[in-house]
Amino acid sequence: AITEAREEAKPYPLFPGPFPGSLQTDHTPLLSLPHASGYQPALMFSPTQPGRPHTGNVAIPQVTSVESKPLPPLAFKHTVGHIILSEHKGVKFNCSISVPNIYQDTTISWWKDGKELLGAHHAITQFYPDDEVTAIIASFSITSVQRSDNGSYICKMKINNEEIVSDPIYIEVQGLPHFTKQPESMNVTRNTAFNLTCQAVGPPEPVNIFWVQNSSRVNEQPEKSPSVLTVPGLTEMAVFSCEAHNDKGLTVSKGVQINIKAIPSPPTEVSIRNSTAHSILISWVPGFDGYSPFRNCSIQVKEADPLSNGSVMIFNTSALPHLYQIKQLQALANYSIGVSCMNEIGWSAVSPWILASTTEGAPSVAPLNVTVFLNESSDNVDIRWMKPPTKQQDGELVGYRISHVWQSAGISKELLEEVGQNGSRARISVQVHNATCTVRIAAVTRGGVGPFSDPVKIFIPAHGWVDYAPSSTPAPGNADPVLII
């Protein structure tokens, strides 16, 4: 928001006047002509001295009268050369020319800075015919001038394919200073110098600048526009504005807040979006960024088990999208999780810690020492194993899944058995004789089925063969054990 003082406020005598030899007024200038109103021109300057030849374009008509007297050259009459007035005032100026009556359809057009003025402009042309000539007065009026009305105005008339151009009328609209550049809000590093810029223009010129910081003037004497203020550094937020002064008064820029960059506030509302056996998806609401964009965040995870060694796992991630999946966690474990984020100044404090738990997972290892042997008397295959280590069960064991595949003469059949968690042995009926039985076992929790053990193969002979020895899980390196009985 720009505050404007009254025009009359002139705190500094800046310069004597905008143009050498020119006058100034706040009255509406009106050009008086013989057929116009009785007002005297309040502020008008003729570009030529009396008696000096006209400088505009002149058309010399070739037509002669009955007495064969050549007609005088056609030219616009001298008029005001320069009008100075205040913004929002009214102005009226005109061009006049006397045209012999032999010419028909004479029209006058108005031009500003080389462009024809068409449409919604207050231009009036009046004709005053006499015996031999018609006086034409073209008036142009602006009811409330703005800065955009500044410029050079001319009249043009076409006669006999000749163009007659008047001398220019310069309109100068004066007002309070107008900002072309105002200070901008900034976020700055504490105790570090920075610059602010302020620029304002008239007319009238010159425009002088005062800087204000937290209601105190920084410079007690004005500086010519444009002005750059070097602020030597701040320790706390400050508000800056600049005042632009000219002969018409002063305009005050918007006040801008300069903030001091600081470490961010800690994130809030850390919450669990999803838990699996080995990962937890968390989200958080970032704290205040300290007037400096977040760069990245750090997720700190520690086991909540009082018997744990208290070590903290740290996961770094980008600041967006305020979401992170923590991986490589143990199943069925409790964790404390905190989040901290950083900007260019430093790290925030850690968010309030939250408790989170991983779910049961499928065991991560297979049962150990799987042994298979044939009990020929009962026509069964006996299987034995050792349960996987508790740490790697990833949940409460609910049983085992046994896969046994029977292969004989191009026929293959897989069967699955489920057994309870108490035992560590199972018995399965022989399905096919003179065949190979391949056995694999997996531990089962509510979280799912773990990996199957390496396959153990046993050959089941035709009836009457003897079971000499068991088959067992191979030692590492023997990929495909087979025991022929």
């Epitope: 500094y12 105790n191 800087w211 937290n214 007690e220 004497q221 030597p232």
Partner: antibody, heavy 118, light 106 residues
């Protein structure tokens, strides 16, 4: 380079007047205000006020209203301090100093000792 | 008006020692300037706007502070630092100076 050169020491009787000058060089005189600072013997610095070298408008600190006048002659880039009805407690060194942004006194005159003694 | 109180008024210090001069304002100010004055000389601009060393001031000097409490620190005192130091506030008229702190070399 910027310099402020002050007039020489003055010995005055009580009730008399004195005018101290401060001639500036090396910069545009009307760009920076001129401050006046008093330092009584063995005492600290006391700001007396300043004069706007652009408009000639003086501003006086409360303790220096009345007998003290700041003036200018911009044609010779000189600021003046005039003290009338001198008193013994006016005995001091008077400094002129330029008025920069944030009231930073970047340049100082060498000081003028005014002694008031009967 | 804002009253500036410097402490100590006087300090006798051995070379290489660290020196801290404080300037406390009776109410909050935006910036504090510091000046150094030696006997029979005019004050010299020393630290501008709380923490900016003036041209030619040795880097062993530093300034800090905000609000009402400001300090001038000399990290390792040298003989040439013997002088009186004045603080001066900007932010509220009239401008005021502290009463000065005189540093003497032992």
């Amino acid at each position: 380079q910027i310099q402020l050169v002050q007039s020489g020491s003055e010995l005055k009787k009580p009730g008399a007047s004195v005018k101290v000058s401060c001639k500036a060089s090396g910069y545009t005189f009307t760009n920076y205000g001129m401050n006046w600072v008093k330092q009584a013997p063995g005492q600290g610095l006391k700001w007396m006020g300043w004069i706007n070298t652009y408009t000639g408008e003086p501003t006086y600190a409360d303790d220096f209203k009345g007998r003290f006048v700041f003036s200018l002659d911009t044609s010779v880039s000189t600021a003046y301090l005039q003290i009338s009805s001198l008193k013994a407690e006016d005995t001091a060194v008077y400094f002129c100093a330029t008025y920069g942004h944030y009231a930073w006194f970047a340049y100082w005159g060498q000081g003028t000792l005014v002694t008031v003694s009967s | 008006e804002i009253v500036l109180t410097q402490s100590p008024d006087f300090q006798s210090v051995t070379p290489k020692e660290k020196v801290t001069i404080t300037c406390r304002a009776s109410s909050s100010v935006s910036y504090m300037h510091w000046y150094q004055q030696k006997p029979d000389q005019s004050p010299k601009p020393w630290i501008k706007a709380t923490s900016n060393l003036a041209s030619g001031v040795p880097s062993r000097f530093s300034g800090s502070g905000s609000g009402t409490d400001f300090t001038l620190t000399i990290n390792s005192l040298e003989a040439e630092d013997a002088a009186t130091y004045y603080c001066q506030q900007w932010g509220t008229k009239p401008l005021t100076f502290g009463q000065g702190t005189k540093l003497e070399i032992k």
